[in-house]
């Protein structure tokens, strides 16, 4: 978790002098509770936006937006703590809006936004906005949270972001798998424009079952430049096991930008349709 373009963070708006600060996610009001605390944020919204760094890289960011309730507690609102927790790693990053002037009611509802938390493809985050100071131990909570799931690199808009392109999202291998005679599979796919090796991982399963009955790995050496974007054809020999008929073919590239952590593509061959077994015809026809 990190912030995009850290030095350009702004939270001031007409009628409010405000500064964005790093936060330890443990505001002082936890340790020294106040008697009077503001109410919770209203209408928390999270959107996925895309932002360029000064280097020209494109990153997905969480755009966080919320409004204030129209009650007198804004007189005691000193700021807000924005927290993003990545659920699979438990990593948390916080920033604090520090109000340098008192808020006053005005003709339209106060609205705040922040769009600098960089998020990763296919990750889930808990986004929380806490008004400050935080409530006394048994006080009503004054925060709002939402769990936000970022699309993965298969998503059309994510595909062109820097983290996705680094993991090989622009490569479309267009895999075809064909069943041949004599227990063989022909796998064909389009090579990318990089001199790097590939691995084909074959996993076979029985019909309607999910435990594998055969596994095989096939190494494909790095292509020469004249072979870039060409089709690579590989014939794999299967184990002669009756009913081991559903095959998943996965192609793992080893691009320089992602090494052994590149996006994999796969294709599946289903078991052949079994024809309905007809009634056996007797060898002879009885005459009576």
């Amino acid at each position: 978790l990190r912030l995009l373009d850290h030095r350009a963070l702004v939270c001031s708006q007409p009628g409010l002098n405000c500064t964005v600060k790093n936060s330890t996610c443990l505001d002082d009001s936890w340790i020294h509770p106040r008697n009077l605390t503001p109410s919770s944020p209203k209408d928390l919204q999270i959107q996925l936006h895309f932002a360029h760094t000064q280097q020209g890289d494109l990153f997905p960011v969480a755009h966080i937006e919320w409004t204030l309730q129209t009650d007198a507690s804004i007189l005691y609102l000193e700021g807000a703590e924005l927290s993003v927790l990545q659920l699979n790693t438990n990593e948390r990053l916080c920033v604090r809006f520090e109000f340098l002037s008192k808020l006053r009611h005005h003709h339209r509802r106060w609205r705040f936004t922040f769009s600098h938390f960089v998020v990763d493809p296919d990750q889930e985050y808990e986004v929380t906005v806490h008004h400050l100071p935080k409530p006394i131990p048994d006080g009503d909570p004054n925060h709002q949270s939402k769990n936000f799931l970022v699309p993965d690199c298969e998503h059309a808009r994510m595909k062109v972001t820097t983290p996705c392109m680094s993991s090989g999202s622009l490569w479309d291998p267009n895999i075809t798998v064909e069943t041949l005679e004599a227990h063989q599979l022909r796998v064909s796919f389009t090579l990318w424009n990089e001199s790097t090796h590939y691995q084909i991982l074959l996993t076979s399963f029985p019909h309607m079952e999910n435990h594998s009955c055969f596994e095989h790995m096939h190494h494909i050496p790095a292509p020469r430049p004249e072979e870039f974007h060409q089709r690579s054809n590989v014939t794999l020999t299967l184990r002669n096991l009756k009913g081991c008929c559903r095959h998943q073919v996965q192609i793992q590239p080893f691009f320089s930008s992602c090494l052994n952590d590149c996006l994999r593509h796969s294709a599946t061959v289903s078991c052949p349709e079994m024809p309905d077994t007809p009634e056996p015809i007797p060898d002879y026809m009885p005459l009576w």
């Epitope: 999270i46 939402k146 769990n147 699309p151 998503h155 808009r157």
Partner: nanobody
Framework: QVQLVESGGGLVQPGRSLRLSCAAS????????MHWVRQAPGKGLEWVSG????????DYADSVKGRFSISRDNAKNSLYLQMNSLRPEDTALYYC???????????????????WGQGTMVTVSS
């Protein structure tokens, strides 16, 4: 033009099933999370279920968990709600709604809904 059209509602007995469909047009359907929202007679809107752009994540309101099943077919620009074991309290106008922004939030919308259908009425009564 941009629109969502629901179908499949009707009168059904308690315990029976119904399948709602929602046909989308005018926007890139497979970019966005989609949701079902209902409104019982004389009540407010209640979020029922949501599904992410690629069906990878799905969530349900506690009141329908285990009985309703949401799905989508991006090739057909369609959203579905399979409703089993229907109860009288499921009687409502069911709306299909598009998430305003990219991404998916558990327990409802991330950023509000910007396209709604006209709704299809489901009445559960003996």
């Amino acid at each position: 033009q941009v629109q969502l059209v629901e179908s499949g509602g009707g009168l059904v007995q308690p315990g029976r099933s119904l399948r709602l469909s929602c046909a989308a047009s005018g926007f890139t359907f497979d970019d966005y999370a989609m949701h079902w929202v209902r409104q019982a007679p004389g009540k407010g809107l209640e979020w029922v279920s949501g599904i992410s752009w690629n069906s990878g994540s799905i969530d349900y309101a506690d009141s329908v968990k285990g009985r309703f099943s949401i799905s989508r077919d991006n090739a057909k620009n369609s959203l579905y709600l399979q409703m089993n074991s229907l109860r009288p309290e499921d009687t409502a106008l069911y709306y299909c709604a598009k998430e305003k922004s990219l991404g998916f939030c558990r327990g409802g919308s991330c950023s509000g809904f910007d396209i709604w259908g006209q709704g299809t009425m489901v009445t559960v009564s003996s």
